[in-house]
Interface confidence: low
């Protein structure tokens, strides 16, 4: 179950998704992708507290354990619930092609 | 793609399916689980370093962003890939009832 | 603006019934747990039960006489078989963040329930 | 069930005081405890979430702490906007002990 997004450490400390901005050099991607020559990805970054945003049993489980064992089991993580697409134009043997990625940008986060 | 499972830092190091013995009191479910007294909890613990079992794309994105900005974009994460049903014995007001939760066992491990 | 407004309170005969509701905006019902919660005049607080993604829980005592729904805006109680003891004034409340914790993060104005023959 | 019992059920204090209010729950609840505030007419207004988590926007006079059955929400110096009912909530299981809330404490001026 999806939880809600109030963050308890303070606006904007919890799991969310956040816009960074890469050229295709930061992303290695200089020498295989013609356009866009700069991404905005979508990436879903903070701290994962009690509960918050629990991906599902597992993810309470771990919050149970992380509290009682913190040096044995890590705190849920914040990671991607769901992508959105992106096509990126890149270069091929005999020009360019459009190829569309499912799994490249962050939609939703929740912590796992 | 999923990727190698080479752990550069050594053996065991790296993102894999670990076991953590836990209780019902540790889970604060000894209220409304009956059986099984005692859970082998399998979890995903471990470091992601470059490419180690990434995910897909967006976790190679984030392994070069988090190279170029550490502070800002945290390293990939282990989190499951799968996961093994388990089966409780619940509590309930006229009873007992077998409940399967599909999403409490990690069954396999990638950094995402 | 987060804000929840609750409506459908008033004067109801013992033995009768009402629904109430609470129109949330500026969030989306489908991320959220709802609550109510009721006070009566000059007592404490109340907790009567919970709509979640799966569905709902009550309060031992609310349970039968109390039913909790949602669409897509709205949380609704509805109340039968109306006693005097259930003259308050009724709340609906956002959960902060669900597992296994469920403080109530926002709250409605509340709306004012008498039951009197 | 899980009963709450707060006290004092009210006290009398002037502003700067350091007040504590109690609250102790019939069996063990871990942290999972949220302390609310209301004044007359209107709806609670959350201070407190797991006992000690300070909710957005209150300030840090006010703290909370406790877990297992006994916790405390401390006003470190009374303010005049602090006279008030006060009430702690378990948060823990809804699903086979629900949420009660304790009975309140009302923090009247001396």
């Known amino acids: 179950a999806r939880n809600g997004d109030h963050c308890p450490l303070g606006p904007g400390r919890c799991c969310r998704l956040h816009t960074v901005r890469a050229s295709l050099e930061d992303l290695g991607w200089a020498d295989w992708v013609l356009s866009p020559r700069e991404v905005q990805v979508t990436m879903c970054i903070g701290a994962c507290p009690s509960q918050f945003r629990a991906a599902n049993m597992h993810a309470q489980i771990k919050t149970s354990l992380h509290r009682l064992k913190p040096d044995t089991v890590p705190a849920p993580c914040c990671v991607p619930a769901s992508y959105n697409p992106m096509v990126l134009i890149q270069k091929t043997d005999t020009g360019v092609s459009l190829q569309t990625y499912d799994d490249l940008l962050a939609k939703d986060c929740h912590c796992i | 793609a999923r990727n190698g499972d080479h752990c550069p830092l050594g053996p065991g190091r790296c993102c894999r399916l670990h076991t953590v013995r836990a209780s019902l009191e540790d889970l604060g479910w000894a209220d409304w689980v009956l059986s099984p007294r005692e859970v082998q909890v399998t979890m995903c613990i471990g470091a992601c370093p470059s490419q180690f079992r990434a995910a897909n794309m967006h976790a190679q994105i984030k392994t070069s962003l988090h190279r170029l900005k550490p502070d800002t974009v945290p390293a990939p994460c282990c989190v499951p890939a799968s996961y093994n049903p388990m089966v409780l014995i619940q509590k309930t007001d006229t009873g007992v009832s077998l409940q399967t939760y599909d999403d409490l066992l990690a069954k396999d491990c990638h950094c995402i | 603006e987060v804000q929840l407004v609750e409506s459908g309170g008033g004067l109801v005969k013992p033995g009768g019934s009402l629904r109430l509701s609470c129109a949330a905006s500026?969030?989306?019902?489908?991320?959220?747990?709802m609550s109510w919660v009721r006070q009566a005049p000059g007592k404490g607080l109340e907790w009567i039960g919970m709509?979640?993604?799966?569905g709902t829980t009550y309060a031992t005592w609310a349970k039968g006489r109390f039913t909790i729904s949602k669409d897509s805006s709205t949380v609704y109680l509805q109340i039968n078989s109306l006693k005097t003891e259930d003259t308050a004034v009724y709340f609906c409340a956002r959960v902060v963040y669900a597992g296994w914790t469920y403080p109530l993060g926002i709250w409605g104005q509340g709306t004012l329930v008498t039951v009197s023959s | 069930d899980i009963q709450m019992t707060q006290s004092p059920s009210s006290l009398s204090a002037s502003v700067g005081d350091r007040v504590t209010i109690t609250c102790q729950a019939s069996q063990s609840i871990s942290s999972v405890l949220s302390w609310y505030q209301q004044k007359p007419g209107k709806p609670p207004k959350a201070l407190i979430y797991?006992?000690?988590i300070l909710a957005s926007g209150v300030p840090s006079r006010f703290s909370g702490s406790g877990s297992g059955t006994d916790f405390t929400l401390t006003i470190s110096s009374l303010q005049p906007e602090d006279f008030a009912t006060y009430y702690c909530?378990?948060?823990?299981?809804?699903?086979?002990?629900?949420?009660?809330f304790g009975g309140g404490t009302k923090v009247e001026i001396k």
């Open positions: 709509i979640s993604f799966s």
């Open positions: 500026g969030f989306s019902l489908s991320n959220y747990y």
């Open positions: 909530q378990a948060n823990y299981d809804v699903y086979n002990y629900g949420n009660p």
């Open positions: 797991e006992a000690s």
